[in-house]
């Protein structure tokens, strides 16, 4: 019998490399059974995760999973950092793994590094 616990499927030690000025959607995959839990996003500041208030969020439904989406419209250099989603389920808090946004502040599209260049940067791989 499948567990009816809420599960948040953000991959452990995942990251996204994005560019300032672009729109970006950060997705929190949520598995639940009967009632969709209340889900929030927070941004890590040291060991504290600061709840993101007043941000544009939405839900997307797929076959076996729902996604709670945090919208960046557009991405700002200050959005660099690690994020976590958490769900309120039966008065318990379930926390996801954190996922990291690496924001590149580029002046124009012609200056954008390729994905290979991004992948070869030690600061990107080991921050």
């Amino acid at each position: 019998k499948e567990s009816c616990d809420v599960q948040l499927y953000i991959k452990r030690q995942s990251y996204h490399s994005i560019f300032a000025g672009d729109p970006f959607k950060l997705e929190c995959p949520v598995k639940y059974c009967a009632h969709r839990p209340q889900v929030t996003w927070c941004k890590l500041n040291g060991t504290t995760c600061v709840k993101l208030e007043g941000r544009h969020t939405s839900w997307k439904q797929e076959k076996n999973l729902s996604f709670f989406i945090l919208h960046f419209e557009p991405v700002l250099p200050s959005d660099n950092g690690s994020y976590r989603c958490s769900a309120n389920f039966l008065s318990a808090i379930i926390e996801s793994h954190s996922t990291t946004l690496y924001v590149t502040d580029v002046k124009s599209a012609s200056e954008r590094p390729s994905k290979d260049e991004m992948a070869s940067r030690p600061w990107l791989l080991y921050s």
Partner: antibody, heavy 120, light 112 residues
Framework: EVQLQQSGAELVKPGASVKLSCTDS????????IHWVTQRPQQGLEWIGR????????RYDPKFQGKATITSDTSSNTAYLQLSSLTSEDTAVYYC?????????????WGQGTSVTVSS | DVVMTQSPLTLSLTIGQPASISCKSS???????????LNWFLQRPGQSPKRLIY???KLDSGVPDRFTGSGSGTDFTLKISRVEAEDLGVYYC?????????FGGGTKLEIK
């Protein structure tokens, strides 16, 4: 049983490149990470790196940076390892392995390995 | 990099004897999520590695309960209560906490 099927053995000349493949027949690779591990003759296991097929982002052991390039194609559920500027030191068996994701995050399923021999 | 040091290099045992393999890491393997991503693999001759134990002490399905994993922080142990012929091969510890991921050098179990 979930299987990772790797491409066949390769005999390549020094200085050449080779691209190995790893196809997951039972699991959507977008949902996890695919790792590559190497084993030189009579030696232990060494981690090369991993890819997140959902977005193509990679992490490598710095000692393989520039030598190995990991890519994936989610339409065919396949991950690839390209090895460049091959030398006799690159003669080894190369394994792909799948990380099983939530909640254990370990290498639960391995391919059968691809033998690469670098020889003139 | 996190260095994983296994000992002994070789174990030569008779059927029914107990076995103990040590794995020490150069840094703590306790992750920020409170879990310790220390795993044990067995590579039988001519085969791919096979996962035996994950998260220090959890046995993979199909692994006999004569295998036990223990430890925390930087010191870990794999024990076999009574060695059987099918246990021969090379045992590797592997850490999945830090990048780059690293394996121990391996411990070869021979049956006398």
């Amino acid at each position: 049983e979930v299987q990772l099927q790797q491409s066949g053995a390769e005999l390549v000349k020094p200085g050449a490149s080779v691209k190995l493949s790893c196809t997951d027949s039972g699991f959507n690779i977008k949902d996890t990470y695919i790792h590559w591990v190497t084993q030189r003759p009579q030696q232990g296991l060494e981690w090369i790196g991993r890819i997140d097929p959902a977005n193509g982002f990679t992490r490598y052991d710095p000692k393989f940076q520039g030598k190995a390039t990991i890519t994936s194609d989610t339409s065919s559920n396949t991950a690839y390892l390209q090895l460049s500027s091959l030398t006799s030191e690159d003669t080894a068996v190369y394994y792909c392995a799948r990380e099983d994701g939530y909640p254990y995050y370990t290498l639960d399923c391995w391919g059968q390995g691809t033998s690469v021999t670098v020889s003139s | 990099d996190v260095v994983m040091t296994q000992s002994p290099l070789t174990l030569s045992l008779t059927i029914g004897q107990p076995a103990s393999i040590s794995c020490k890491s150069s840094q703590s393997l306790l992750d920020v999520d409170g879990k310790t991503y220390l795993n044990w693999f067995l590579q039988r001759p001519g085969q791919s590695p096979k996962r035996l134990i994950y998260l220090v002490s959890k046995l993979d399905s199909g692994v006999p309960d004569r295998f036990t994993g223990s430890g925390s922080g930087t010191d870990f142990t794999l024990k076999i209560s009574r060695v059987e012929a099918e246990d021969l091969g090379v045992y590797y510890c592997w850490q999945g906490t830090h990048f780059p991921r690293t394996f121990g050098g391996g411990t070869k179990l021979e049956i006398k």
